[in-house]
């Protein structure tokens, strides 16, 4: 047990001890999106408000033009919720010529873009087709999961039609990350 | 390198350091709900298994009274999952006079009381039309995001009807919250 | 205050400190399925990538066998989405003889064995009743929470039909769990 | 009840600027977006943008961007859109509207402020 | 770039029903918060009718009704009466989020 005695409760630690109350963290909040034009095939990202009202961000976690910016390498855990709205789907007319229509649907996904790498890297989606009967219809995806993150790299949320994303409430629709 | 010998790995810590088993956590779950009086235009709040089968409160984190107690400022990951069930939505008699009805819905909201603030706060929501066709039905809403909290604020559990809450098993509905 | 000299910043701590960075950690990702025998009353497990793509097990937290092994003890985030798709549900017939019909539904269940207790114990459970109208469909369920675990505890996800998992792509279905 | 009331009619020469003011009350200021939308003379209605006068957050149609400048003072509880570079097709009654914030339909309209831009 | 089409103008003796028409050049016209109607009398600001395809705003009479069908949205004015002359605008969102305005039109009551 030689020199263990300057030791003290912490002999098990190979990495660097860092207090959690510094580590980079972020809680994005909706905000309105401004009108802007953008590829048909290419999923429109979301902006965010990122110091008004729940929002924050903190330890060198910066949000700029759509995206979170990863100050630090590690595994961090990252999450949103995009709540969705919308008039009543055409697929409610249920069948046409006896067969099902393709139907109408939802997504988000958050992701990765890393400088270095020429194409982005979707982390997470959540999908769901919708096809509503008779009347307006809401709903939220989540999504949430820890992934190995790279100082540089940069988050992002895209959907499926930026049309449809409730904006009304900061509580609806979010996005957040933090380190591990 | 002068009077590094003395910090050995965790040089760079300006907050206090502390033990990641030593933090306020909680996770509680779905008990049979007790007929109360709530107010038309205000949903009804939970309450929680604290102690048996998965439920837990540690460190400080205590439970009381439909309410989880903050002990500690800090930042939080606070979630929740609520299963509804119910019968066959009016919404599914599809159209009256050609128009659609007002969507049937389901809400869970994640909400923030502090004592020396007036009005609640709502963290999180999660909302759905239910406008099922044919059948019982019964699905889950999940919530979860890491909020700034302060010592004393009180975390409850808010749903749009108590009724279609599902309180059959402690896995189906459940709420909980952890200091980062 | 004797001795205090040599405790500089972190004295409040009574459990050992331990560097975040090593604890362990897993995120793994869908893959194709293969044909498996289960017996009819019970939902069969999922097995997963664990080393390719997103996916990663690191710092003890080993996979095998459809399982996650928890290599020590203490308080464990646990995640899962699943993605199901599948054809229009029978359910869609809306009634027969004037009664709903029993209905379709998608189920996931994160379980926990313990090789010391007969029965498995179900932590988390996300349900729904599927009754779709007049297409495909498509759908994620996501489930979160903090649960206490002992070393050796095996985590596995069930879910009520395999044949609905959506296995094309690793951001939408995936499974994970992290020490915090 | 809610009311917009906006500020009288201006005159502006080609290449001005001329900035309208929208005065709420009846509401709470800060919890609706405010639209723009102008009408010239014997023509149909014009969306011009929309301001968010809690967080100062905006969003312009693309014809305006670079032209139109969308403020709120939440002091007093009242919107601004000032119009650059003005020319003679700008002359139209410009009007505000308050959303309702589910369907962001235009609910509470004011009375109109008619900007004529001729040399 | 989306387009709201409007008939430029529809008439109809007192009590009785028109329909004014509004049609998307494409499909997405008004998935997230629907279609809406605004009636202006000469000299006023417009007065919102109708939100949300079928809604009517509390104060505005029940003769005057919603409808959607596929890309195209109506509204239908019942028992028309002398004061319900004036310009009609149909209005929606496209998938940019601009706020679009149908060109208008023009409803006179004969007689």
């Known amino acids: 047990l030689k020199g263990q005695e300057f030791a003290p409760s912490h002999q098990q630690v190979y990495a660097p001890l860092r207090a959690d109350g510094d580590k980079p963290r972020a809680h994005l909040t909706v905000v309105r999106q401004t009108p802007t034009q953008h590829f048909k095939n290419q999923f429109p990202a979301l902006h965010w408000e990122h110091e008004l009202g729940l929002a924050f961000t903190k330890n060198r976690m910066n949000y700029t033009n759509k995206f979170l910016l990863i100050p630090e390498s590690g595994d961090y855990f990252i999450y949103s919720q995009v709540t969705f709205r919308g008039m009543t789907s055409e697929c409610s007319e249920i069948r046409q010529a006896g067969r099902p229509n393709k139907p109408d649907s939802i997504t988000v996904v958050i992701t990765k873009v890393t400088d270095s790498y020429p194409e982005p890297t979707q982390l997470l989606m959540g999908t769901k087709s919708v096809c509503e009967v008779g009347s307006n219809w809401f709903q939220p995806i989540y999504l949430g999961a820890m992934f190995s993150l790279q100082e540089g790299d940069k988050l992002m949320v895209n959907v499926s039609d930026i049309s449809l994303v409730d904006y009304t409430k900061e509580d609806k629709t979010f996005f957040g990350a933090f380190l591990l | 390198l002068k009077g590094q010998e003395f910090a050995p790995s965790h040089q760079q810590v300006y907050a206090p350091l502390r033990a990641d088993g030593d933090k306020p956590r909680a996770h509680l779950t779905v008990v049979r709900q007790t007929p109360t009086q709530h107010f038309k235009n205000q949903f009804p709040a939970l309450h929680w298994e604290h102690e048996l089968g998965l439920a837990f409160t540690k460190n400080r984190m205590n439970y009381t009274n439909k309410f989880l107690l903050i002990p500690e400022s800090g930042d939080y990951f606070i979630y929740s999952q609520v299963t509804f069930r119910g019968m066959t939505s009016e919404c599914s008699e599809i159209r009256q006079a050609g128009r659609p009805n007002k969507p049937d819905s389901i809400t869970v909201v994640i909400t923030k009381v502090t004592d020396s603030y007036p009005e609640p706060t709502q963290l999180l929501m999660g909302t759905k039309s239910v406008c099922e066709v044919g059948s019982n039905w019964f699905q889950p809403i999940y919530l979860g995001a890491m909020f700034s909290l302060q010592e004393g604020d009180k975390l409850m559990v808010n749903v749009s009807d108590i009724s279609l809450v599902d309180y059959t098993k402690e896995d189906k509905t459940f709420f909980g919250a952890f200091l980062l | 205050l004797k001795g205090q000299e040599f405790a500089p910043s972190h004295q409040q701590v009574y459990a050992p400190l331990r560097a975040d960075g090593d604890k362990p950690r897993a995120h793994l990702t869908v893959v194709r399925q293969t044909p498996t025998q289960h017996f009819k009353n019970q939902f069969p497990a999922l097995h997963w990538e664990h080393e390719l793509g997103l996916a990663f097990t690191k710092n003890r937290m080993n996979y095998t066998n459809k399982f996650l092994l928890i290599p020590e003890s203490g308080d464990y985030f646990i995640y899962s989405q699943v993605t199901f798709r599948g054809m229009t549900s029978e359910c869609s017939e809306i009634r027969q003889a004037g009664r709903p019909n029993k209905p379709d539904s998608i189920t996931v269940v994160i379980t926990k064995v313990t090789d010391s207790y007969p029965e498995p114990t179900q932590l988390l459970m996300g349900t729904k009743s599927v009754c779709e109208v007049g297409s495909n469909w498509f759908q994620p369920i996501y489930l979160g929470a903090m649960f206490s675990l002992q070393e050796g505890d095996k985590l596995m996800v069930n879910v009520s039909d395999i044949s609905l998992v959506d296995y094309t792509k690793e951001d939408k279905t995936f499974f994970g769990a992290f020490l915090l | 009840q809610v009311q917009l009331v906006q500020s009288g009619a201006e005159v502006k020469k080609p290449g001005a600027s001329v900035k309208v003011s929208c005065k709420a009350s009846g509401y709470t200021f800060t919890s609706y977006d405010i639209n723009w939308v102008r009408q010239a003379p014997g023509q149909g209605l014009e969306w011009m943008g929309w301001?968010?006068?809690?967080?100062?957050?905006?969003g312009y149609a693309q014809k305006f961007q670079g032209r139109v400048t969308m403020t709120a003072d939440r002091s007093t509880s009242t919107a601004y859109m000032e119009l650059s570079s003005l020319r003679s097709e700008d002359t139209a009654v410009y009007y505000c509207?308050?959303?309702?914030?589910?369907?962001?339909?235009?609910?509470?309209w004011g009375q109109g402020t008619l900007v004529t831009v001729s040399s | 770039q989306s387009v709201l089409t409007q008939p430029p103008s529809v008439s109809g003796a007192p009590g009785q029903r028109v329909t004014i028409s509004c049609t998307s050049s494409s499909s997405d016209i008004g998935a997230g918060q629907g279609v809406h109607w605004y009636q202006q009398l000469p000299g006023t600001a417009p007065k919102l009718l109708i939100e949300?395809?079928?809604n009517r705003p509390s104060g505005v009479p029940d003769r005057f009704s919603g409808s959607k069908s596929g890309t195209s949205a109506s509204l239908t004015i019942t028992g028309l009466l002398p004061e319900d002359e004036g310009d009609y605008y149909c209005q929606s969102y496209d998938g940019t989020l601009s706020a679009l305005f149908g060109g208008g039109t023009k409803l006179t009551v004969l007689g």
């Open positions: 301001l968010n006068p809690n967080s100062g957050n905006t």
């Open positions: 949300g395809y079928y």
């Open positions: 509207a308050r959303e309702v914030p589910e369907t962001a339909a235009f609910e509470y």
